[in-house]
Interface confidence: low
């Protein structure tokens, strides 16, 4: 190999050992029969050398540094050449370094041709091994602007006072151009400006200077984003730290062309703007740090650019001004993460503050819009509390548990609407009366409607789930002793069409001791399946529930249990079941922890089924499933 560096070229070539390998045989640079491990070639020198081994790329690296002095004379602007040409260099991992020194008043601009650059964070590497490391200068201090790969959005980087650009090329890479040019600009009056150009949808992750170490004290760094007008951009902070400020405040500033409120100033912990149309700038401003305990300012953020969907231009008004104790959350539905680029899905308040989830509270009118490629990626969860604190005022009062139409008109699927129903302890109980009779969801007869009501205790210490109920059954009402939550859960987008079938009224009624009472009016020719609350986990200790089952005059009811034994084993107390004819008051009592369950029995009049639990031993729980079937009476037995 022969390397000849012209005089005044200000180029130094250094060939040195790379990271040590476990190769047994050493390799040397051979010059005039001398074996050396490092070779430095300066401007004006010409050196001929060889290597003592077949694969020098496994041993050595080459650094080519060009110093460009813009202080004493004119600066050589324009496209930067790879000198010496890569074809003249040995095939080693190569690093070309350009060190440009300039006056503080001169701005320097690195312009990158296609492909543009993509910034990478600590620990990341570039797929093709080609990396661009860029640093600037503040007085004598070197500041790392960042490390970049190809195929990104960064098109230009502007700095002042000097720039150091290192282009690392693996030995096998055929690249023979620098891929950038240098231009002079007027002073930028800040550390640097990074321009990021989006041609279409995509995302870019960018970092403050020196990341993950601290951003230089009291400095200013700007990112300029070039975004086609028909696309929308959103900013989200992935990671940030604040330093301890003595004077001034650390902040980010957005400059949005055409905005009347420029610059828009945000704290780093604020929700960052979204749904921005067209170009915008983002600046990070540091502060004067506490000398004793400076801390560090650092920021890693993502800009997501995507199409506005039809929805993003629509403003939806959610009027919760007449609601009390209610909150509505729009959030992403859980999905498996995919590795390919997925456009963001945001909900925006007043069209500007966008985030992946948003909670609206009662008492106000809210204007929201969406910035999302597919609104099925979001769903809504609503919570509303209806509480009674004075039993004299609430008794016999009724409330309709209906999803407000404002919420139904939103283009996002409703997942859960939960009503928390709270009553004064030992003073009042609750009754739920559906607009359409309900069916209890069981394995034997599952609900296949687009929504169900999930009824559960809302007493924190009590683990009691009454069940899941959907329209189209035989349960006429459900009475519960104390606080409960009723959740309308939707299972299909067709809920919008079936919304008229929802409708549940809750009334506050005089207190009763049983945990729950189900009033069942079976329809002829259909089998009604009923099961004890807390299915799969067992009826809680010492809990009692009842079913009031109506039998029309011309029908007979067949009561069937689906197990031979209840399976419960009591630690203390007794578990029992009472079946009582309502007309004659005649009753049968069964010990659930001892007796076998009754064989199918026929009832000509309305009857009660009451089940009371003991304190069972762990693992031996009380779960019962039974059915009621009506058939016409063949003989009048009255």
């Amino acid at each position: 190999f022969e390397i000849a560096l012209p005089r005044e070229s200000n180029i130094t070539v250094l060939i040195k050992l790379g990271t040590p390998t476990l190769l047994a045989k050493p390799c040397y640079i051979v010059i005039s029969k001398r074996h050396i491990t490092m070779l430095s070639i300066k401007s004006g020198e010409r050196i001929v050398f060889t290597f003592s081994c077949q694969s020098p790329e496994n041993h050595f690296v080459i650094e080519i540094q060009k110093n460009i002095d813009c202080m004493s004379g004119p600066c050589p602007f324009g496209e930067v050449q790879l000198q010496p040409s890569t074809s003249l260099l040995p095939t080693l991992n190569r690093t070309f370094i350009w060190d440009v020194k300039a006056h503080k008043s001169i701005g320097l601009e690195l312009q990158f041709s296609i492909p543009r650059l993509r910034q990478i964070g600590p620990g990341e590497s570039c797929p093709d091994g080609v990396t661009h490391s860029i640093s600037g200068r503040i007085d004598a201090t070197v500041v790392r602007i960042g490390t970049f790969c190809s195929n990104g959005t960064v098109s230009r980087i502007k700095m002042q006072e000097g720039v150091k650009m290192a282009l690392h090329l693996p030995w096998f890479h055929p690249r023979n151009v620098s891929g950038f040019s240098i231009a002079n600009r007027s002073s930028i009056k800040r550390l640097c400006i990074i321009e990021s150009v989006f041609e279409g949808e995509g995302s870019a992750t960018l970092m403050s200077a020196n990341y993950p170490e601290g951003f230089p004290e009291d400095e200013l760094m700007t990112w300029q984003f070039v975004v086609p007008a028909h696309l929308r951009a959103s900013v989200s902070f992935l990671n940030f730290n604040l330093s301890n400020c003595e004077r001034k405040e650390e902040r980010v500033e957005y400059y949005i062309p055409g905005s009347t409120t420029n610059p828009e100033v945000f704290k780093l912990e604020d929700k960052q703007p979204g749904n921005m149309a067209g170009n915008f700038n983002l600046s990070l401003q540091g502060c004067d740090q506490d000398a004793q305990s400076p801390g560090i300012l650092r920021l890693q953020f993502q800009v997501l650019v995507q199409h506005p969907q039809n929805e993003s231009n629509k403003i939806y008004v959610v009027d919760l001004s007449n609601e009390r104790a209610m909150s509505l959350t729009i959030e992403p539905r859980p999905v498996k993460q995919s590795r390919k680029f997925v456009p963001g899905c945001f909900v925006c308040l007043e069209s500007r503050t966008c985030s992946s989830n948003l909670t609206l509270t009662s008492g106000s009118k809210h204007k929201i819009s969406f910035l999302c490629d597919d609104l099925t990626r979001l769903w809504m969860n609503v919570e509303k509390t209806i509480s009674c604190t004075d039993h004299r005022y609430c008794q016999r009062k009724s409330y309709s548990l209906q999803v407000p139409s404002d919420i139904l008109h939103l283009p996002v699927e409703l997942h859960d609407f939960s009503w928390k129903l709270l009553v004064p302890k030992d003073r009042l109980s609750l009754v739920l009366v559906p607009a359409q009779k309900l069916q209890q969801h069981t394995h034997e007869k599952p609900c296949n409607t687009s929504f169900s009501y999930l009824v559960a205790s809302a007493i924190p210490s009590q683990d009691l789930y009454f069940g899941s109920f959907c329209p189209g059954g035989s349960i006429k009402q459900i009475q519960v002793k104390q606080n409960i939550s009723v959740t309308l859960r939707t299972f299909a987008p067709s809920f919008q069409q079936e919304a008229s079938r929802q409708g549940l009224t809750v009334s506050f009624i005089p207190y009763f001791k049983e945990e729950g009472v189900f009033t069942v009016t079976p329809d002829t020719k259909s089998k009604v399946y009923l099961r004890t609350p807390n299915w799969d986990r067992g009826l809680p200790s010492l809990t009692s529930v009842s079913w009031n089952i109506s039998v029309p005059r011309d029908q007979v009811a067949c009561l069937t249990f689906f197990k031979e034994r209840s399976g419960v084993v009591c630690q203390t107390g007794r578990a029992f079941m009472i079946i009582q004819e309502q007309r004659t008051r005649a009753e049968e009592i069964f010990s659930l922890d001892e007796d076998v369950l009754p064989k199918p029995s026929f009832h000509h009049h309305s009857f009660w089924v009451n089940i009371s639990n003991c304190s069972p031993t762990s693992g031996k729980q009380l779960d019962l499933l039974f059915s009621v079937t009506l058939t016409p009476r063949t003989v009048d037995l009255t």
Epitope: I114, V197, V226, H230, P257, A277, G278
Partner: antibody
Framework: EVQLKESGGGLVKPGGSLKLSCTAS????????MSWVRQTPEKRLEWVAT????????YYSDSVKGRFTISRDTGKNNLYLQMSSLSSDDTALYYC?????????????WGQGTTVTVSS | DIVMTQAAFSNPVTLGTSASISCRST???????????LYWFLQKPGQSPQLLIY???NLASGVPDRFSSSGSGTDFTLRISRVEAEDVGVYYC?????????FGGGTKLEIK
């Protein structure tokens, strides 16, 4: 000097297919966005499709979505429009044109056009 | 879709005098970023369209400064200060604010 030259037009039966090409020279082809625009026999201009610069994102008008595909071969400096399920409404003079997203220009340069006639 | 409307013919003008061509859009082309996404093209007889004005008021490269454009968000005017014989042709306005990009029907400049 920037030059665009379309080719591949011709007479085709309804339901048939055709592939138009546009050969570019005089500029860095990969950097520029490229569009196909057609001019109907009544001299109305209709935007058909765009392929963005650098990232190769595609945009189509509703009238051709699902039937036409815009693509490029940067090595050959060629832009293509693959057309299928053609109907008489697609009869037009087809132009390719450049756009520069960085400056904000659109339709900076146009080719001479190639004629597509759909008729039985 | 945004519809661009133009008169089919201009008022006949004398060479050396000024001419105006109008264009109207069904939606404001003024974006919140301050840019108006309106374009003017000229198609001379037997030629391809050529770009005259981009983003409402910017002169495309090589276009003489006799051409200028102004407007609000929905009403736009292209002015030619001293009409020359080579200005004859059909003038099209277009928008690329929103997909699909749309053109006006074109206005033919007539010389007296």
């Amino acid at each position: 000097e920037v030059q665009l030259k379309e080719s591949g037009g011709g007479l085709v039966k309804p339901g048939g297919s055709l592939k138009l090409s546009c050969t570019a020279s005089g500029f860095t082809f990969s950097v520029y966005g490229m569009s196909w625009v057609r001019q109907t026999p009544e001299k109305r201009l209709e935007w058909v499709a765009t392929l963005s610069g650098g990232s190769n994102y595609t945009y189509y008008s509703d009238s051709v979505k699902g039937r036409f595909t815009i693509s490029r071969d940067t090595g050959k400096n060629n832009l293509y429009l693959q057309m299928s399920s053609l109907s008489s409404d697609d009869t037009a003079l087809y132009y390719c044109a450049t756009e520069d997203g960085l400056i904000g220009t659109w339709g900076d340069y146009w080719g001479q056009g190639t004629t597509v006639t759909v008729s039985s | 879709d945004i519809v661009m409307t133009q008169a089919a013919f201009s008022n006949p003008v004398t060479l050396g005098t000024s001419a105006s061509i109008s264009c109207r859009s069904t939606k404001s082309l003024l974006h919140s970023n301050g840019i108006t996404y309106l374009y003017w093209f000229l198609q001379k007889p037997g030629q391809s369209p050529q770009l005259l004005i981009y983003q409402m008021s910017n002169l495309a490269s090589g276009v003489p400064d006799r051409f200028s454009s102004s407007g609000s968000g929905t009403d736009f005017t292209l002015r030619i200060s001293r009409v020359e014989a080579e200005d004859v042709g059909v003038y099209y306005c277009a928008q690329n604010l929103e997909l699909p990009f749309t053109f006006g029907g074109g206005t033919k400049l007539e010389i007296k």
